[in-house]
């Protein structure tokens, strides 16, 4: 009685259970009454990352420098190449097929999380008591200057974009 299901790492063909090819190898010939499955290693710049019955290996991903990409991890016969972005850029998707320049946080906003090769800058509005007067991909919101610690008084209130302006205390004369 021919099998209707096969063990793990096998596949059913022509009423026979054949061994799948191991990662890094492609299928040449299905097993037969006389022979085991025939597999061949993937070529240079090719890979297969699972037990498989593929007749063609997949091409390694190309990290195109024209798109701001560079190789983070070189592919093997069993793994794909992993791309990342050049310094100052980040991936537009999880697959990292292209890069965009890191976003800068506008005045009134500070950097909450600095960008990486795979994630953009995260900005946050400067809360009361903090400001940012530059457009930057690195600068956090800075605290307003404390006039009191300098024995000065606030002459102009700060905003989310400007620091306070301190000045000398008015001395009342008798």
């Amino acid at each position: 009685e021919p099998p209707t299901a096969c063990r793990e790492k096998q596949y059913l063909i022509n009423s026979q259970c054949c061994s799948l090819c191991q990662p890094g190898q492609k299928l040449v010939s299905d097993c037969t009454e006389f022979t085991e499955t025939e597999c061949l290693p993937c070529g240079e710049s090719e890979f297969l990352d699972t037990w498989n019955r593929e007749t063609h290996c997949h091409q390694h991903k190309y990290c195109d420098p024209n798109l701001g990409l560079r190789v983070q991890q070189k592919g093997t016969s069993e793994t794909d190449t992993i791309c990342t972005c050049e310094e100052g850029w980040h991936c537009t998707s999880e697959a990292c097929e292209s890069c965009v320049l890191h976003r800068s946080c506008s005045p009134g906003f500070g950097v909450k999380q600095i960008a990486t090769g795979v994630s953009d800058t995260i900005c946050e509005p400067c809360p009361v008591g903090f400001f940012s007067n530059v457009s930057s991909a690195f600068e956090k919101c800075h605290p307003w200057t404390s006039c009191e610690t300098k024995d000065l008084v606030v002459q102009q209130a700060g905003t989310n974009k400007t620091d306070v302006v301190c000045g000398p205390q008015d001395r009342l004369r008798a």
């Epitope: 037969t32 006389f34 022979t35 025939e38």
Partner: antibody, heavy 113, light 112 residues
């Protein structure tokens, strides 16, 4: 449908080289393996060697030194070449696909001067 | 090189009676994957060998169920439950586990 057909010289002189071609149809030689068997008159079959789908070859220990099996996938042909023939090489030569029971009709080769 | 030894060399059988042929291998025919590539062929007079049984016990398509194969490791048997006239010929065991592939010397079945 699957077919294999051998074409050989029929008569070969001792010490000469034998060339037989197996032309196949109904399948691709890049996906299937083919082996060669010979059977001398009144004797049992002898496995000679094979050409795997991936292009590698295996040979009988006793024939290895004078046997070459090759293929031309685009022409759907597997070739057998055997040198230094003697009368003991007189046999019917078959090419066979390595699955099911697909045999060529066989070609009789007689080695005689 | 692996040897396959068949017995008996000649097997006279009465029509309708059972027949049994033995094939012994000089080393185990179990492959690393667990398959055992031991096969049985029948060669009728004037014909090429025809596959009866593959991988010890699997009947090839179109082969009558009076033919059965069994065994493991190095000892294998072909059985015919009731011999018919068309079963006359030479039976060969063959292995494709180890390169070079080999054939047994043959068993000639004839009707008594």
């Amino acid at each position: 449908q699957v077919q294999l057909q051998e074409s050989g010289p029929g008569l070969v002189k001792p010490s000469e080289t034998l060339s037989i071609t197996c032309t196949v149809s109904g399948f691709s030689l890049s996906r299937y393996s083919v082996y060669w068997i010979r059977q001398p008159p009144g004797k049992g079959p002898e496995w000679m060697g094979m050409m795997w789908g991936g292009g590698s070859t295996d040979y009988s220990t006793s024939l290895k030194s004078r046997l070459t099996i090759s293929k031309d996938t685009s022409k759907s042909q597997v070739s057998l070449k055997m040198s230094s023939l003697t009368a003991a090489d007189t046999a019917v030569y078959y090419c066979v696909r390595t699955d099911g029971d697909y045999w060529g009709q066989g070609t009789l080769v007689t080695v005689s001067s | 090189e692996l040897q396959l030894t068949q017995s008996p060399l000649s097997l006279p059988v009465t029509l309708g009676q059972p027949a049994s042929i033995s094939c012994r291998s000089s080393q185990s025919l179990a492959s690393s994957s667990g398959n055992t590539y031991l096969h049985w062929y029948l060669q009728r007079p004037g014909q090429s060998p025809r596959l009866l049984i593959y991988k010890v016990s699997n009947r090839f398509s179109g082969v009558p169920d009076r033919f059965s194969g069994s065994g493991s490791g190095t000892d294998f048997t072909l059985k015919i439950s009731r011999v018919e006239a068309e079963d006359v010929g030479v039976y060969y065991c063959s292995q494709s586990t180890h390169v070079p592939w080999t054939f047994g010397g043959g068993t000639k079945l004839e009707i008594k």
